[in-house]
């Protein structure tokens, strides 16, 4: 969480951003909130990016003002216009690319004063893993698949019964480049699994950590998946 203040005493307002991550190919959200104003026409929102000459986005007098927008952001940005009045200056970004990573500034002007806060935006790819029993294998085998990751993640297997065990010798992980030549499909196979045990496939890079669990008993199979972004710090 980054909380920024204006510079001049009573003419400063609090602006708050949250560091976040964008999943390339999807739309992303750059979060920013501020002390609201009574009149929409008195609010100016400017989004800037370090190293970019033009503006990322500008909203003033109740509407978008995009004459100074940088070329790389044309048609790719939107604020939640109906939520500006309650202090939401968050920016939606269309079709996130690797090059969108960087430091952004959310700069706000209202009748109460000015304020700004920076936001670190990481970009990559992350997805939920799914763990299944591989019935095609010659021995009891689990297969963990996740369709999109970047940068290349690490994959670690764990088990509820054998806590702390190292499964690297009985697992094999491969990375297959997807059609857009950036993201990769992750496939990890765990051999010699035992029944009545819960296994976890943990995939992690510097952006996200995802876990796929599978519990195999004689009568049923239960699955669960979880994904967590690693850098969601507010400022």
């Amino acid at each position: 969480l980054i909380i920024g203040f204006g510079i001049s005493g009573r003419h400063s307002i609090t602006v708050t951003t949250v560091a976040s991550a964008g999943n390339i190919g999807e739309d992303g959200i750059l979060s920013c909130t501020f002390e609201p104003d009574i009149k929409l026409s008195d609010i100016v929102i400017q989004w800037l990016k370090e190293g970019v000459l033009g503006l990322v986005h500008e909203f003033k007098e109740g509407k978008d003002e995009l004459s100074e927008q940088d070329e790389m952001f044309r048609g790719r940005t939107a604020v939640f216009a109906d939520q500006v009045i309650v202090g939401n200056a968050s920016l939606r970004l269309k079709n996130v690319q690797l090059t969108d990573a960087g430091t952004y500034k959310c700069y706000i002007i209202t009748s109460k004063g000015k304020g700004n806060a920076n936001l670190e935006y990481k970009t990559g790819a992350f997805s939920m893993p799914e763990v299944n029993v591989d019935y095609n294998a010659s021995s009891e085998t689990l297969r963990c698949e996740a369709p999109r990751w970047f940068p290349q993640p690490t994959v670690v297997w764990a088990s509820q019964v054998d806590q702390g065990a190292n499964f690297s010798e009985v697992s094999n992980t491969s990375f297959e480049l997807n059609s857009e030549n950036v993201t990769m499909k992750v496939v990890s196979v765990l051999y010699n699994v035992t029944i009545n045990n819960t296994y976890s496939c943990m995939i992690e890079n510097d952006i996200a950590k995802a876990t796929g669990d599978i519990k195999v008993t004689e009568s049923e199979i239960k699955r669960r998946s979880h994904l967590q972004l690693l850098n969601s710090k507010a400022s």
Partner: antibody, heavy 123, light 107 residues
């Protein structure tokens, strides 16, 4: 009421280039919307080809990217599709469509469509 | 790319009855899903976006639900003009992709 109208040759020779234009009326191509091309082979499903913003920014379907060019002509309020090295597999009804963007909603669904034009690839 | 799978391929229902169409995504698309209706010789027509929001002018008998990977289009009381092909489309991830369609026919 926005209207879209596709135009272009209905027959293209194999290895040739398919060229279509979409004329926009009842609205400006310089609005906040993206403008798309979608195709539908006879009796089959729909496939997004690509999209363009009035600034010239584009997104292309990776499966067609090496063969596709979409351009915009703001003075004529129209946008165009070129698909090179065509084969019989490119025979389809080609639709132009407008992205349904409105502030606070995601881009990506299509709220206005042209009536479509059938393009046959054959010698 | 995200694969959208619709079921059933064909659905036979009598006028006045309820029709339920399903759409499944190969990975989560959040609520970024649209439904279209297409009649022979016509372009698709937007019914639902945001998984559950009806487009302008769409009758209340059409409703959408779901999020993540599982979605449903329900037509509460079928009218004669509702028999057509229905497509779902995800717009969470580029390239946007469509299901193969469900043909709704008169029983």
């Amino acid at each position: 009421q926005v209207q879209l109208q596709e135009s272009g040759p209905g027959l293209v020779k194999p290895s040739g280039t398919l060229s279509l234009t979409c004329a926009v009326s009842g609205g400006s191509i310089s609005s906040s919307n993206w403008w798309s091309w979608v195709r539908q082979p006879p009796g089959k499903g729909l496939e997004a080809i690509g999209e363009i913003y009035h600034s010239g920014n584009t997104n292309y379907n990776p499966s067609l990217k090496s063969r596709v060019t979409i351009s915009v002509d703001k003075s004529k309020n129209q946008f165009s599709l070129k698909l090179s090295s065509v084969t019989a597999a490119d025979t389809a009804i080609y639709y132009c469509a407008r992205d349904g963007y409105s502030s606070g909603w995601y881009w990506g669904y299509f709220d206005y469509w042209g009536q479509g034009t059938l393009v046959t690839v054959s010698s | 790319e995200i694969v959208m799978t619709q079921s059933p391929a064909t659905l036979s229902v009598s006028p006045g009855e309820r029709a339920t169409l399903s759409c499944r995504a190969s990975q989560s698309v959040n609520s970024n899903l649209a439904w279209y209706q297409q009649k022979p010789g016509q372009a698709p027509w937007l019914l639902i976006y945001g998984a559950s929001t009806r487009a302008t002018g769409i009758p209340a008998r059409f409703s959408g639900s779901g999020s993540g990977t599982e979605f449903t289009l329900t037509i509460s009381s079928l009218q004669s003009e509702d028999f057509a092909v229905y497509y779902c489309q995800q717009y969470n991830h580029w390239p946007y992709t469509f299901g193969q369609g469900t043909k709704l026919e008169i029983k």
